[in-house]
């Protein structure tokens, strides 16, 4: 039997049953999430659930730029350091950089400081690039 790999929307890239879209536009976290949702298919800001997934994403983004942080779907909606993925995925894999997570920083970004392999918290109203994800 021939197993067909599902196709992603134009410009989105495929990895292990998911499609990813890297948006090089500036949006605050909530506007980025709304834009992801606007593409349908259950798209949200991306959850990153393993080192393998993180490495694939990081390699892809590094082909475009190495200096701008990128919003992902991890946030702290109750502002109590209770982080959760906006798409409902289990918060098991963690890749925080060593920076302090205090202050008014309740949204997570992939940090350019470690080639996008680690995360930092940031103020949710900051306008940044963002990464969307859906399962085709």
């Amino acid at each position: 039997d021939i197993i067909m790999r599902p196709s992603c929307a134009p410009g989105w890239f495929y990895h292990k049953s998911n499609c990813y879209g890297y948006f090089r536009k500036l949006r605050n976290w909530s506007d980025a999430e709304l834009e992801c949702q606007s593409y349908g298919n259950g798209a949200h800001l991306a959850s990153i659930l393993s080192l393998k997934e993180a490495s694939t994403i990081a390699e892809y983004i590094s082909g475009y730029q190495r200096s701008q942080p990128i919003w992902i779907g991890l946030h702290d909606p109750q502002k109590r350091q209770q982080w959760q993925w906006i798409d409902g995925a289990m918060y098991l894999y963690r890749s925080w950089s060593g920076k302090s997570m205090g202050g008014n920083k309740h949204c997570a970004e992939m940090s350019s400081n470690n080639n996008f392999l680690t995360w930092s918290s940031n103020e949710c109203n900051k306008r940044q690039h963002f990464l969307c994800k859906y399962r085709p």
């Epitope: 134009p10 410009g11 879209g21 090089r24 536009k25 082909g63 475009y64």
Partner: antibody, heavy 121, light 109 residues
Amino acid sequence: EVQLLESGGGLVQPGGSLRLSCAASGFTFSSYAMSWVRQAPGKGLEWVSAISGSGGSTYYADSVKGRFTISRDNSKNTLYLQMNSLRAEDTAVYYCARGAGATPFNAFDIWGRGTTVTVSS
Amino acid sequence: FMLTQPHSVSESPGKTVTLSCTRSSGSISFDYVQWYQQRPGSSPILVIFEDDQRPSGVPDRFSGSIDSTSNSASLTISGLQSEDEGDYYCQTYDDNRQVFGGGTKVTVL
């Protein structure tokens, strides 16, 4: 008043060199990325090269890579384009354009009047 | 990738024209699209930035939009006036380079 003024264009033989300058005024020059965009006679716009506000990052179109060098002197508020190994297809009006931010990939919100480069024997 | 624009468009004063800009590969949504107006003998002027934003001084007759289904951007000029005549270029970027469309010549009849 925000202004960009190009100079240095002229007639040059194929294989020759030319250095274009763009004098900026009316804004904090070092806070903005800058680009060169050209327009061949009767043709459309073609991006040539870009440089970040600090000058630390430079970018080139494939058509000029290895022949042209972009640079800036923030103390003089001036952008440069050193053009070597010129070809007939480099004949164009060269515009200096300001990017809307410190990184090169933004809108071009201010344009100069352009300087004409003619490559011919 | 390339940005493809129709070569020319003509319309009467007061009417509305919509110019298209289609991206050949990659998603039009991933990067901002800008639009520039170039009147004959003049330098280009930014009329739309970041897909749909108008710089101060540009009339609200100019509007921009993105359609991910057709993978294209559009510039709409309503209430067409004689001074709108000229060439219009879309522009975006990808992989450390800027890309312009070939331009659309707008003629006001």
